[in-house]
Every structure is written in C-alpha cells, then in structure tokens.
C-alpha cells in the first residue's frame, strides 16, 4: 500500500494510473466504500462523501490514462485509505494528514516560550525535528518547546515530520518581539543635546500599545518616570512628561526621545518599557547616559564624568598633541597649575575614545575660555 503524507490546509494529489493510455471509467472510494468521485465519460461525478466540495480530479490527464484524486484544504480527519478502481483493478493509497501549529500566536515577546504542537491522525507515530533560523535543532513527539526565545529566533522555523520513512516539511514564521538592542550607552558633553533611539527588531502592520521611560539618576536615591506615551497604529502620542527634564518625543517609529541638555544630574540609567496590545509581558530596553564636564577653577583643571561607566574605562587629561598628564580608571581627574593651551579630557575604552571635551587654559593673567 502506497503511503502519502499531507499537510493540513494544503492540497494533495493521489495518483491512479491505467494501463490503457486513454480516458476510461474510474472511481475513487474511501475505506468505507463510499464513492468520492469518478467519471461519466468526459464528465466528473461526485459521490456523497464528506470530501464532496473539496475533491476534484485533473481532467487533462484522463486521456493519458491518469485519474488523480485531488483533495483541497486538507483536514486531519481526511487521513484514510483511498481506493481507485480502474480496469477491474484496485489501487490503494494511505493518506496521513499532519498539522503543525505554534502556541496561541507566532508573534512572541523576547524571553517567552515557543511551543509547537503536532496534530496527527490516530494510529500514527510520527517524529518531529525543527530547525530554528539560527540553526539550532530540536526534536520531539507531539509537542516541541523552546524556552527563552531570543531575537535570533525570529524567522522561518523548518520542521520535518517523519512517518513510514516518508517526510513532510512545515515552515512556520516566528516573530520575536524585541528592541534591536537590549542596552545602549550615550556619551555626551555637558550642555549637548541628547538623542535616545529605541528601534524595534520587527515590523508589523499595526502596532498599538503604551510605554514608559523610568530613569535612575546616579545622584538620585530613587528612580522616576520621565515620560509615558501611547502607540496607536505606529503613531506616538505623549501622555505625560516630567517638567525636569522636559523630554521631547518623535511622533513616528522608531521611538525617539530628545533631552535638550546633557547635565550631570541627568546622568544615569533608564529603562524603556513597551506593552503591546493583546500581548502579555513587556518589551524592555536599557539606556545609559554618561555626561562629561571639564572645568578650571583657580589653579585646578578638573575633568569629571557622571553615569554608568565600566571600571575599565580610562579618564585622561592631556595638553593637545602631548602625552597625557594624568590617566586614571576613575570618574574624576585633575591637573594642578596647568600649562596654557588647549587641554583635552578623554574618556576611552582600550584606546578608543568614547567622549572628548576641550578646554582652553589661558596664561594665568586671563580667565579660562570653554569652547
């Protein structure tokens, strides 16, 4: 008996061939001997089976002695043995229909679990293997689970169902809802305008939800909400914003926030959360602001940074085109009685400059100029 595997919702074509290469009488029946379809000369005839409106044949092949049974929009319950009667012969084909579906939704939040469930006909014992977009293989029986979805899990999952040495392939598109970056750091000189961007790692036609940016300033004892906003069909509208700082927000995606001035009191860490409509859980992106200030007070030239810096960052003070006078893994450095000239304060990571502030030291009879 020939075995054919089908996919739920798809179309399958079961073949039946006569030795005579011409159109002759044929009938397709199911295992209960109920007629599905056949022919009356050049016309199709349909029986009282439950497949009636989903069964068809390919008439262009009849004149070549081929009488296929086409079943559209396959259902699991279409799994059966189908019998083709032609030329006093009977050809039997066993059809097994499988379905593979993702739990509840194919749009999942980062960190959530993905469960794939296999629907199979009674009496079958299939095995399933799925390959994620990043090449990770998972195996299982009726259900397969992947916990802690990551951004790289977005894309097409390819699952192979194996039964009777035959296989059928399913492709399921999974969208992991997340921000492009989990965390970002913005380095700014005091007084500069700060731009925070929160690009999403997915695109959907309609995006609706609400969000909030909580900020923990380094100097503050507790965090506070800087801004709350709504998102409706990709349009952003601000609900509430603090007076200090007075953030501005872009009306379109990607989410974009502007802080008019980088000030030491704003340096710190923020957490932007986005709750999407019809989704449990929230998307998160951490954002950090590091602010630098270079000052000269009497005979002391000081450079300071505020905000979340890693211990391996180096803070230096140097006169232009000269070696650094001072370099420390600290958040403040200074030089007493600095020479006249253009001084540079540098925040660097393994030789790569992250932030730079220049200050001009004038001869002692004049006052300093800060460009």
């Amino acid at each position: 008996k020939k075995v054919v595997l089908g996919k739920k919702g798809d179309t399958v074509e079961l073949t039946c061939t006569a030795s005579q290469k011409k159109s002759i009488q044929f009938h397709w029946k199911n295992s209960n001997q109920i007629k599905i379809l056949g022919n009356q000369g050049s016309f199709l005839t349909k029986g009282p089976s439950k497949l009636n409106d989903r069964a068809d044949s390919r008439r262009s092949l009849w004149d070549q002695g081929n009488f296929p049974l086409i079943i559209k929009n396959l259902k699991i319950e279409d799994s059966d043995t189908y019998i083709c009667e032609v030329e006093d012969q009977k050809e039997e084909v066993q059809l097994l229909v499988f379905g593979l579906t993702a739990n509840s939704d194919t749009h999942l939040l980062q960190g959530q679990s993905l469960t794939l469930t296999l629907e199979s006909p009674p009496g079958s014992s299939p095995s399933v293997q799925c390959r994620s977009p990043r090449g990770k293989n998972i195996q299982g029986g009726k259900t397969l689970s992947v916990s802690q979805l990551e951004l790289q899990d977005s894309g097409t999952w390819t699952c192979t169902v194996l039964q009777n040495q035959k296989k059928v392939e399913f492709k399921i598109d999974i969208v992991v809802l997340a921000f492009q970056k989990a965390s970002s750091i913005v380095y700014k000189k005091e007084g500069e305008q700060v731009e925070f961007s929160f690009p999403l790692a997915f695109t959907v036609e309609k995006l609706t939800g609400s969000g909030e940016l909580w900020w923990q300033a380094e100097r503050a004892s507790s965090s506070k909400s800087w801004i709350t906003f709504d998102l409706k069909n990709k349009e952003v509208s601000v609900k509430r914003v603090t007076q200090d700082p007075k953030l501005q927000m872009g009306k379109k995606l990607p989410l974009h926030l502007t802080l008019p001035q980088a000030l030491p009191q704003y340096a710190g860490s923020g957490n932007l959360t986005l709750a999407l409509e019809a989704k449990t859980g929230k998307l998160h992106q951490e954002v950090n602001l590091v602010v630098m200030r270079a000052t000269q007070l009497q005979k002391n030239l000081t450079c300071e940074v505020w905000g979340p810096t890693s211990p391996k960052l180096m803070l230096s003070l140097k006169l232009e085109n000269k070696e650094a006078k001072v370099s420390k893994r600290e958040k403040a450095v200074w030089v007493l009685n600095p020479e006249a000239g253009m001084w540079q304060c540098l925040l660097s990571d393994s030789g790569q400059v992250l932030l730079e502030s220049n200050i001009k030291v004038l001869p002692t009879w004049s006052t300093p100029v800060q460009p």
């Epitope: 011409k22 002759i24 050049s42 016309f43 199709l44 008439r59 262009s60 009849w62």
Partner: antibody, heavy 120, light 107 residues
Framework: EVQLLESGGGLVQPGGSLRLSCAAS????????MSWVRQAPGKGLEWVAG????????YYADSVKGRFTISRDNSKNTLYLQMNSLRAEDTAVYYC?????????????WGQGTLVTVSS | DIQMTQSPSSLSASVGDRVTITCRAS??????LAWYQQKPGKAPKLLIY???SLQSGVPSRFSGSGSGTDFTLTISSLQPEDFATYYC?????????FGQGTRLEIK
Amino acid sequence: EVQLLESGGGLVQPGGSLRLSCAASGFTVGSWYMSWVRQAPGKGLEWVAGIWYEGSNKYYADSVKGRFTISRDNSKNTLYLQMNSLRAEDTAVYYCARLGTASLPYFDYWGQGTLVTVSS
Amino acid sequence: DIQMTQSPSSLSASVGDRVTITCRASQDIRSYLAWYQQKPGKAPKLLIYAASSLQSGVPSRFSGSGSGTDFTLTISSLQPEDFATYYCQQSYTAPPTFGQGTRLEIK
C-alpha cells in the same frame, strides 16, 4: 468536415416507441462521447443520454432512465436513441451532439435535429 | 445536479450596442462553462468553451469571463446576425446542465 444528421422523428401516440438515428461523417463515432440533447417547443436545452467509446458505458437523465436506450453501430458510424413508453412531455426536437475530449468536455458539433411529437 | 441560472431571460438591444449576459451556477464549476448561440429552427452553435476560450471561427466580438459560480458572455458591438437565443452550459459534473436561455431581440 464533421457532420451529424438525425432522422427517425415523427408523430407517435403516448406509450408508443420510436427509434432515432444520427449518421456521422468526418469522424468516428466509436472514438467520442456522443450525446442526445432535446429541446421542448419554446423551451431550453436538456441533456438526455450519452454513450462513451465502445458503448459499454451509457448514461441517462433521470427523466428518461428505464425508457430510453442509447446505442451505436460503429460499422455504420451511427448513433441511435431507442425511445419506449413515450409521454407527452417527451415532445421535443432531438439533437445528437458530439462532446469534446475529457479536458474540453463541450458539445462542439450538433446535428440539425429531428422533431418527436407525442400526442393522441 | 448543478442548476444554471441565466439573466436576463430576454433583452432588447440595437446594432452596435455592447451586451452582457450572466450565468450563475448553483455550485463551484471551476471554469467548465460553455456558451452556445441558437437561431430559430437551427441547432445550437458553440461560441465559448472553458469560460473564456473562443471556439474557432467565432468572431472576436464575443468574449467570456468568470470562474467558480459567476460567468458572463459579452458581445462588444452587436451585429444583425447576433440576434438569437444564448445558452450557458456546465461541463464540470454529470449530468451536463444548461441555463434556461437569454433571448436577444432587436430594439
């Protein structure tokens, strides 16, 4: 050139019999699905019967099943319709028609028709 | 059996007019539909088959469209010889069935 020519029509009493013939030229009747189609006066077209290939498979409209018999004589290249137990509602012009192939199942050639009148 | 319903039953038009006749099947017949023209006292003549294919020798002013359950026959510019009765017929499942006809008359 394909041609179909019907004959055998006429006036017959209810319950009577009549045999219609359709002589074909330009093709072989035994290689095609052949049909009889009728048209009552002032009415539409109604398929009556069909015969396929060597004549082993015959099909009928429910309205004539058990009363009419379709057949053919390949040697004479002729199609027949034997009509028994005729009723007044069988009064019509009877056409013989050839059906195209399985992939093009349409009546591509028709005869000129023969009138059958069932009346007492 | 599949029922075929034509509309309108009759239609008056003038030479040069564009005319459309519709045919509806009681169930999906894919594209297995033919249109025939019949003149008084004559046999039907095949115009269109497979819903939209023009039978050889039929003028190009005749065209057919549709699939599934809804079909149309269009005559782009009526000629005097086009005044006749038109029938649609399904060939999807046995038995083949015809529409009741549309009589096209001169206005």
